[in-house]
């Protein structure tokens, strides 16, 4: 918090300009108004001010609109953007595709944050629908917002998005969404051959059903045990020992250092303790 | 007790089609991979047809792809192979086998298929 | 295609007889070789699924051994039920493959 001080005499600002960088965190907190702040945002972009001067800008806003800033003002945040938490987004209610926009530039060649996450929920909430506008302003959807958004409405994401998409930017999906995301995935890279096709669709398989792990036993894909953890135990549980044997190859070691963790200690014991018996692994049902 | 039961085997000309039927209990159908084998006389076992478990998958090697289909109702707990321009090749004894993984685990007993003029 | 190749393709064995049959993949297989026993007129049954597991049922004189291209199936002590033809199945590659037979018969 900055301390509350009277702004020294010729001081006041009357717009916001680069005379500002000049003043000490305390000045700009008791001499720029926030309601001037809040018409002139566009201007404090092409001002160089420290990340500590942007502190006061924001908390400035803040006080101002507690219950979360208007679209005039969140078009115009610029760098202020970077600033904001997921909590100070989530009061936001964007509808503007420019001021979507706006802000996706701000972040361009940063890592995806959790603020654009947020963000794009926000703006998808306060539209409705991911529509089509939506998915040409982003180029489809950037790939690390997926987990962002609901089930519903990454149903609307077409299987053309996926192809960008890399295992990390699926790291926060659940359960619910993957469910979503791997028709899609499916349908994206069914022309892809088996290998091929199994590198990319490893990522997405957290929403493959039983019969799809199956089809994939069938095609030399040695699963690595990391990605067999992430499947769905509803799907897991439906594979024989046989088919876990030829899905992991020679990765069907692994089971034994996963057997009390879910899901694999799920699929256990499920199984016929013969059959475990058989691996040679020493496995417990 | 596992069973599988094949019926539509006969005779047919070169050409011709015939639509083999396998009816299997004794297990959750709706549960496994299905595959039709077959035999030629005196000769040894050739994989024909493998379909998945839904039926979203099927799997046929070169000498059949394009001629046979392989297909199934899960709610009869039945197993179909489609034949088309059939060969006199295509002689032999055709089993239905439940597959599990990479194994024929069960078989029926077969149905000749004799394709001849 | 993965061709698999039966040695010897028949043999004369009496009761009592260990007899050793081998079979050889065109290529590596890991482990996903499966044995099948027919006898004539009857249906294939399945002895022995990834090279050495004894599927439900079968006695224990049957075993498998091996890896990668070259495997075995041992009968330790020949019963007369035990005379039939018998074939080796890879299923590690699509399409799935059968050797040609190996018959066992009666000395």
């Known amino acids: 918090e900055v301390e509350k001080t009277a702004c020294p005499s010729g001081k006041k600002a009357r717009e916001i300009d680069e005379s500002l960088i000049f003043y000490k965190k305390w000045e700009l907190e008791a001499c720029v108004d926030a309601a001037l702040l809040a018409t002139q945002m566009d201007r404090v972009n092409a001002i160089p001010f420290t990340y500590e001067q942007l502190d006061v800008l924001k908390h400035k806003l803040d006080e101002l609109y507690p219950q979360g800033y208007p679209e005039s003002v969140i078009q115009h945040l610029g760098y202020l953007f970077l600033k904001m938490s997921p909590e100070d987004i989530r009061k936001w209610n964007v509808t503007s595709l420019e001021t979507l926009k706006a802000l996706l530039e701000v972040n361009k060649g940063h890592e995806m944050s959790p603020q654009v996450a947020t963000l794009i929920d926000r703006f998808v909430k306060g539209r409705g629908q991911l529509d089509k506008d939506t998915l040409d302003t982003l180029g489809d959807i950037p790939p690390g917002y997926l987990c962002s958004l609901s089930p519903e409405e990454l149903s609307s994401v077409p299987p053309s998005s996926i192809w960008a998409v890399r295992p990390q930017d699926l790291d926060t999906c659940d359960p619910r969404q993957l469910d979503v995301l791997y028709p899609k995935a499916r349908l994206a890279f069914q022309n892809m051959n088996g290998s091929e096709y199994f590198v990319k669709i490893q990522s997405f398989l957290g929403g493959a059903p039983t019969e799809d792990l199956r089809a994939l036993s069938q095609h030399n894909v040695s699963m690595d045990i990391a990605t067999f953890k992430r499947l769905q135990v509803d799907s897991l549980v439906g594979l024989s020992v046989a088919e876990v044997q030829k899905l992991l190859g020679p990765n069907i070691v692994d089971l034994k250092t996963e057997e009390d963790k879910s899901p694999v200690r799920d699929w256990l014991f499920r199984q016929h303790q013969k059959d475990l018996d058989r691996l040679g692994l020493g496995l417990q049902g | 007790e596992v069973q599988l039961v094949e019926s539509g085997g006969g005779l047919v000309q070169p050409g011709g089609s015939l639509r083999l039927s396998c009816a299997a209990s004794g297990f959750t159908f709706s549960d496994y991979f299905m595959s039709w084998v077959r035999q030629a006389p005196g000769k040894g076992l050739e994989w024909v047809a493998t379909i998945s478990n839904g039926g979203t998958y099927t799997y046929y090697p070169d000498s059949v792809k394009g001629r046979f289909t392989i297909s199934r109702d899960n709610s009869k707990n039945t197993l179909y192979l489609q034949m088309n321009s059939l060969r006199a090749e295509d002689t032999a004894v055709y089993y239905c086998a439940r597959f599990d993984g990479y194994i024929f685990d069960y078989w029926g007993q077969g149905t000749l298929v004799t394709v001849s003029s | 295609d993965i061709q698999m190749t039966q040695s010897p393709s028949s043999l004369s064995a009496s009761v009592g007889d260990r007899v050793t049959i081998t079979c050889r993949a065109s290529?590596?297989?890991?482990?996903?070789l499966n044995w099948y026993q027919q006898k004539p007129g009857k249906a294939p049954k399945l002895l022995i699924y990834?090279?050495?597991r004894l599927h439900s049922g079968v006695p224990s004189r049957f075993s498998g051994s091996g890896s990668g291209t070259d495997f075995t199936l041992t009968i330790s002590s020949l019963q007369p039920e035990d005379f039939a033809t018998y074939y080796c199945q890879q299923g590690n590659t699509l399409p799935y493959t059968f050797g040609q037979g190996t018959k066992v018969e009666i000395k």
């Open positions: 990834y090279t050495s």
């Open positions: 290529q590596d297989i890991s482990n996903y």
